[in-house]
């Protein structure tokens, strides 16, 4: 059985479209599961993995490897 584009699995009922944009950064494995591109995480792979050591409380990142500090915090790790 050949599935339509973006459909996977037994019965072709699993949907996955690879994307690399604001709404997700992932490929699809042979079963239609999302596999996040390097530097991205979360169920939709749209959450950047910040610089290692970046304070989860006082730092954040829009792009992988970044560490942007909240107002009033500074340093490489916003700690």
């Amino acid at each position: 059985v050949t599935c339509d584009d973006y459909y996977y699995g037994f019965g072709c009922n699993k949907f996955c479209r690879p994307r690399d944009d604001f709404f997700g950064h992932y490929a699809c494995d042979q079963n239609g599961n999302k596999t996040c591109m390097e530097g991205w995480m979360g169920p939709e792979c749209n959450r950047a993995i910040c610089r290692q050591g970046c304070s989860p409380k006082h730092g954040s990142c829009k792009l992988p490897g970044d560490c942007r500090c909240q107002y009033g915090w500074q340093g490489l790790y916003c700690d």
């Epitope: 339509d4 584009d5 973006y6 699993k14 949907f15 996955c16 479209r17 944009d21 604001f22 709404f23 997700g24 979360g42 169920p43 939709e44 749209n46 959450r47 950047a48 910040c50 954040s60 990142c61 829009k62 792009l63 970044d66 942007r68």
Partner: antibody, heavy 119, light 107 residues
Framework: QVQLVQSGAEVKKPGSSVKVSCKAS????????MHWVRQAPGQGLEWMGA????????AYAQKFQGRVTLTADKSTSTAYMELSSLRSEDTAVYYC????????????WGQGTLVTVSS | DIQMTQSPSSLSASVGDRVTITCRAS??????LAWYQQKPGKAPKLLIY???TLADDVPSRFSGSGSGTDYTLTISSLQPEDFATYYC?????????FGGGTKLEIK
């Protein structure tokens, strides 16, 4: 279960700004974008933009670029939509909404916030 | 940007009727289409996504079909609670635009 609870109705003067809040619960706030959709009285639905609460990244519909600001407070799991330079045509119900799992479109919606712009 | 054209804009039908609403995209949206139902004073409710997949707790009388640029929502046998406004929406690429809506009224 996923819940999105919005702030109450607002009446604003033309030229002013409004800030609508959307408090999320029942899921990890930083895992999904929060989208905003508006609906003028008797009209259709209009996508305004989205924010990724984890890092603050935003995407806006061109029509609203420069006039709308989306923000998120991770500590309270609350998203905000601020619309500036209000005009009468901005009178609408504003909804926050979230995608479902496996790339669903908008499976979860807030109850809506009516913003009335009147002099 | 992809535009969505929905037709008809309004429709009168009776309980038990079979009803079809169509949506045409200005470009190929590869089945990335959703249908919503909205009742007055309420938020929209997701009915169908990926053109043909029924959302949770949606009755089987609703079905979706289509591909490429042309899509259809069918209600096989109208029930009293189905009288509402229906919207299509693509989510292929931002901006995720909606169709203009179809108001389904009791004949």
């Amino acid at each position: 279960q996923v819940q999105l609870v919005q702030s109450g109705a607002e009446v604003k003067k033309p030229g002013s700004s409004v800030k609508v809040s959307c408090k999320a619960s029942g899921y990890t706030f930083t895992d999904y974008e929060m989208h905003w959709v508006r609906q003028a009285p008797g009209q259709g639905l209009e996508w305004m933009g989205a924010i990724q609460p984890g890092g603050g990244g935003t995407a806006y519909a061109q029509k609203f670029q420069g006039r709308v600001t989306l923000t998120a407070d991770k500590s309270t799991s609350t998203a905000y939509m601020e619309l500036s330079s209000l005009r009468s045509e901005d009178t609408a119900v504003y909804y926050c909404t979230r995608r479902g799992y496996d790339d669903y479109p908008f499976a979860y919606w807030g109850q809506g916030t009516l913003v009335t712009v009147s002099s | 940007d992809i535009q969505m054209t929905q037709s008809p804009s309004s429709l009168s039908a009776s309980v038990g009727d079979r009803v079809t609403i169509t949506c045409r995209a200005s470009g190929n949206i590869h089945n990335y289409l959703a249908w919503y139902q909205q009742k007055p004073g309420k938020a929209p409710k997701l009915l169908i996504y990926n053109a043909k997949t029924l959302a949770d707790d949606v009755p089987s009388r609703f079905s979706g079909s289509g591909s490429g640029t042309d899509y259809t929502l069918t209600i096989s046998s109208l029930q009293p609670e189905d009288f509402a406004t229906y919207y299509c929406q693509h989510f292929w690429s931002a901006p995720w635009t909606f169709g203009g809506g179809t108001k389904l009224e009791i004949k």
